[in-house]
């Protein structure tokens, strides 16, 4: 229904407190470079001005668009042009292009300093000191750096960080608290930024069809017991708030979201029979809770999906009058019967049914012609299956760390023109597929392991987007969205690559090193790992376990040393001496 | 490998007319074959499409007065109750091998005038 | 029922030059089922691209699909004098019954 004054109107449905936080990530997301203060300054003038409108809804401006007034308020920052260069240029054109010139401008790389949580005793200073402030900083800070973060789920993160805060400020060894539960949120944060970028990416590329597939096999894995109309509805629903998300309309997106889930809750009977625990909690836990339901028990009696999709004499025919409901009803039944199966997966599946018919639905004897499309999966399906089985085993054998080295190295060969930096970042983020995936139960690991996977792949593709150096990287990631994993595994050594120079440079270390904590350790050896690939790219697998070896001791012994700095400046030299002689 | 239509003149409106298009070199028992029709310095009409197997699909404003049909080696497009909007040059054409629904047609006849007028 | 949009028309341009037509679909076609005509007067359409931007056998590379969804261009570039007919865009919906032809745009050569 249209309201007088859309702000009014999402202001009351929001309340005052998520509706401060909303408006705080679309500017943090939109302006990434902008000090906390200067953004708290203009949250506080949107929310008075949206008081104004609750209180007279025919209030001068209350009738413009949200857009509109976010848009006015970026445009009047005083310096816009000195801070953010050509975005300024948004500020000449008209709504709807003005958005689309603020989101043309987002920068999934942004150049700030890694967000360093502070020590146990001052964040629980500052905490209880201004618990409002503190948590703005915090959804300031992460917005700024993930400007596709799902915002109304980034506000439940918020109120975790506020849970977790509480709770072990009054402890007594407040880190000995706060660093595991922190770490804890931290981790499922960033899962949750790479997922929701993928998201938007999917968005964007491919449009709302797509996305729209993508949720109707992911709900009917969730809730095989609901109907396909029931499926379709959730799926269109979910479509509609991630393009909201997507398209910077934070306040539209976290109250359909509350929507949804307040339909969920009022629709359990032909929804699911695992709602229930979620429904009872308030509205961020409720939604959240619902995002991450587990699947329902697989209805016993299901009949074999040949039957409507292979056996019926009315295949091509149902296929050809309504392609988007055949296909649609495909992807449903066949998801429902895989909870074991990836979503990238069962659209693979999906999309070489759907050739299979498009083939051989104008032939002559079309079920002859399609009559196998089904056996036709084992491929696509053991393809995914002996990934994990292989990937998981090297894991089990080398650990997080050594298994993200294995991975290193692999996409460094695949594509050694990437930047170092991108490499490791995305090998670590591969690597930790691992921990997050090995561990689970046969059942669950292959859709943890790819869809995990797929997601990382996209943050590599929108970094590679910004800067494009690799033709083979470009080719994965300009195809589907659902075949850019498997693209990935299918890359080889690129032997169109001119090895890198040795430069001694980057291979001198210091005694900082030593102080660093265990992660930057890490990231530096890691570093010089990619390094040395791009160096020697055809290096094998032994001549590489003994220079990192070798680094390892070298580094160990030096920080070991009295004279930490004279050990770097005189062991430093022999050891590149050393790994050249190795890996000539 | 070619189509040609034929059976186009001129009629009356109301009156039924039936043109063929006959194939030479191609097994229509193999491949799809639409007909597209085009109105005197206009753009292009698809009216609807026959698959191998004799299964036919319209355009939804063609439904009910046009029916495609394929007696033997040549593809019929039978018309009711024409009126003067009808009046068209009529095309048929082959829909690309290892395509059911899609809009590619890569051979086509040199097409047949219809013009209906009193 | 599916409409396809085309601009401009018509359109000249110089011999060498470049010529870009759009082609509009409401609502997204599907799963790029998009494909470019050329068709001189007196004679049956040509299909130059099909799948949005794959180009057919013997159609020079002078011509380039690209696009995805609701909105599609055919670029020309180093325009030829035989370039000069009407370009008509078609898309295919998830009915079959929706297939539609663009209003076709003429590209006239100066």
């Known amino acids: 229904e249209a309201h007088k004054s859309e702000i009014a109107h999402r202001f009351k449905d929001l309340g005052e407190q998520h509706f401060k936080g909303l408006v705080l990530i679309a500017f943090s997301q939109y302006l990434q470079k902008c000090p906390y203060e200067e953004h708290i300054k203009l949250v506080q003038e949107v929310t008075d001005f949206a008081k104004t409108c609750v209180a007279d809804e025919n209030a001068e401006n209350c009738d413009k668009s949200i857009h509109t007034l976010f848009g006015d308020k970026l445009c009047a920052i005083p310096k816009l042009r000195d801070n953010y260069g050509e975005l300024a240029d948004c500020c000449a054109k008209q709504e709807p292009e003005r958005n689309e010139c603020f989101l043309q401008h987002k920068d999934d790389n942004p150049n700030l300093p890694p967000f360093q949580r502070p020590e146990a005793e001052a964040m629980c200073t500052s905490f209880q000191e201004n618990p409002t402030s503190f948590l703005g900083h915090y959804l300031h800070e992460v917005a700024r750096r993930h400007p596709y973060f799902y915002a109304p789920e980034l506000l439940y993160y918020a109120e975790k960080y506020n849970e977790v805060l509480t709770q072990c400020c009054t402890e007594s060894d407040k880190a000995a608290c706060l660093t595991p539960k922190l770490d804890a949120v931290k981790e499922k944060a960033l899962v949750a930024a790479v997922r929701q970028r993928m998201k938007c990416s999917s968005m964007q590329r491919f449009g709302e069809r797509a996305f729209k597939a993508w949720a109707v096999a992911r709900m009917s894995q969730r809730f095989p017991n609901a109907e396909f109309a029931e499926i379709t509805k959730l799926a269109t629903d979910v479509t509609k708030i991630n393009k909201e998300c997507c398209h910077g309309d934070l306040l539209e997106c976290a109250d359909d979201r509350a929507e949804l889930a307040k339909y969920m809750c009022e629709n359990q009977a032909t929804i699911s029979s695992k709602l229930q625990a979620c429904c009872d909690k308030p509205v961020l836990q409720k939604s959240q809770c619902l995002a991450e339901i587990e699947h329902d028990n697989i209805p016993a009696d299901l009949p074999s999906i040949a039957a409507d999709f292979v056996e019926d004499k009315e295949v091509c025919k149902n296929y050809a009058e309504a392609k988007d409901v055949f296909l649609g009803t495909f992807l449903y039944e066949y998801s429902r019967r895989h909870p074991d199966y990836s979503v990238s997966l069962l659209l693979r599946l999906a999309k070489k049914y759907e050739a299979t018919l498009e083939k051989c639905c104008a032939e002559g004897d079309p079920p002859a012609c399609y009559g196998t499309v089904l056996a036709e999966f084992q491929p696509l399906v053991e393809e995914p299956k002996n990934l994990v089985k292989t990937n998981c085993e090297l894991y089990e054998k080398l650990g997080e760390y050594g298994f993200q080295n294995a991975v290193l190295v692999r996409y460094t060969q695949k594509a050694p023109q990437v930047s170092t930096p991108t490499l490791v970042e995305a090998a670590r983020n591969l690597g930790r597929v691992g921990t997050k995936c090995c561990t689970l139960p046969e059942a669950q690991r292959l859709p943890c392991v790819e869809d995990y996977l797929s997601a990382i792949l996209n943050r590599l593709c929108v970094l590679h987007e910004k800067t494009p150096v690799s033709e083979k990287v470009t080719k994965c990631c300009s195809g589907s969205l659902v075949e850019r994993r498997p693209c990935f595994s299918a890359l080889t050594v690129d032997e169109t690559y001119v090895p890198k120079e040795f430069k001694a440079e980057t291979f001198t270390f210091h005694s900082d090193i030593c102080t660093l904590p265990d992660k930057e350790k890490q990231i530096k050896k890691q570093t010089a790992l990619a390094e040395l690939v791009k160096h020697k790219p055809k290096a094998t697998e032994d001549q590489l376990k003994t220079v990192m070896g070798d680094f390892a001791q070298f580094v160990d012994k030096c920080c070991k040393a009295a004279d930490k700095d004279n050990c770097f400046a005189t062991e430093g030299p022999n050891l590149v001496a050393r790994s050249k002689e190795a890996l000539a | 490998q070619s189509l040609e239509e034929s059976g186009g003149r001129l009629v009356t409106p109301g009156t039924p007319l039936t043109l063929t298009c006959t194939v030479s070199?191609?097994?229509?028992?193999?491949?799809?074959i639409n007909w597209v029709r085009q109105a005197p310095g206009k753009g292009l009409e698809w009216i609807g499409i026959?698959?191998?197997?004799?299964t036919t699909f319209y355009a939804t404003w063609a439904k009910g007065r046009f029916t495609i049909s394929r007696p033997s080696t040549t593809v019929d497009l039978e018309m009711t109750s024409l009126t003067t909007a009808d009046t068209a040059t009529y095309f048929c054409?082959?829909?690309?091998?290892?395509?059911?629904?899609?809009?590619?047609?890569?051979?086509w006849g040199p097409g047949t005038l219809v013009t209906v007028s009193s | 029922a599916a409409v396809l949009t085309q601009t401009p028309s018509p359109v000249s341009a110089a011999v060498g030059g470049t010529v870009t037509i759009n082609c509009q679909s409401s609502?997204?076609?599907?799963?790029?089922?998009l494909s470019w005509y050329q068709q001189k007067p007196g004679q049956p359409p040509k299909l130059l691209i099909y799948?949005?931007?794959k180009l057919t056998s013997g159609v020079p590379s002078r011509f380039k699909g690209s696009g995805s969804g609701t909105q599609f261009t055919l670029t020309i570039s180093d325009v030829q004098c035989g370039d000069a007919a009407t370009y008509y865009c078609?898309?295919?919906?998830?009915?079959?019954?929706?297939?539609?032809f663009g209003g076709g745009t003429k590209v006239v050569v100066k």
């Open positions: 799948e949005a931007s």
């Open positions: 070199g191609i097994d229509l028992s193999n491949y799809a």
């Open positions: 609502p997204s076609v599907w799963s790029n089922f």
């Open positions: 026959i698959w191998a197997s004799g």
């Open positions: 054409a082959r829909t690309v091998p290892g395509y059911s629904t899609a809009p590619y047609f890569d051979l």
């Open positions: 078609g898309g295919g919906y998830s009915s079959i019954s929706d297939t539609t």
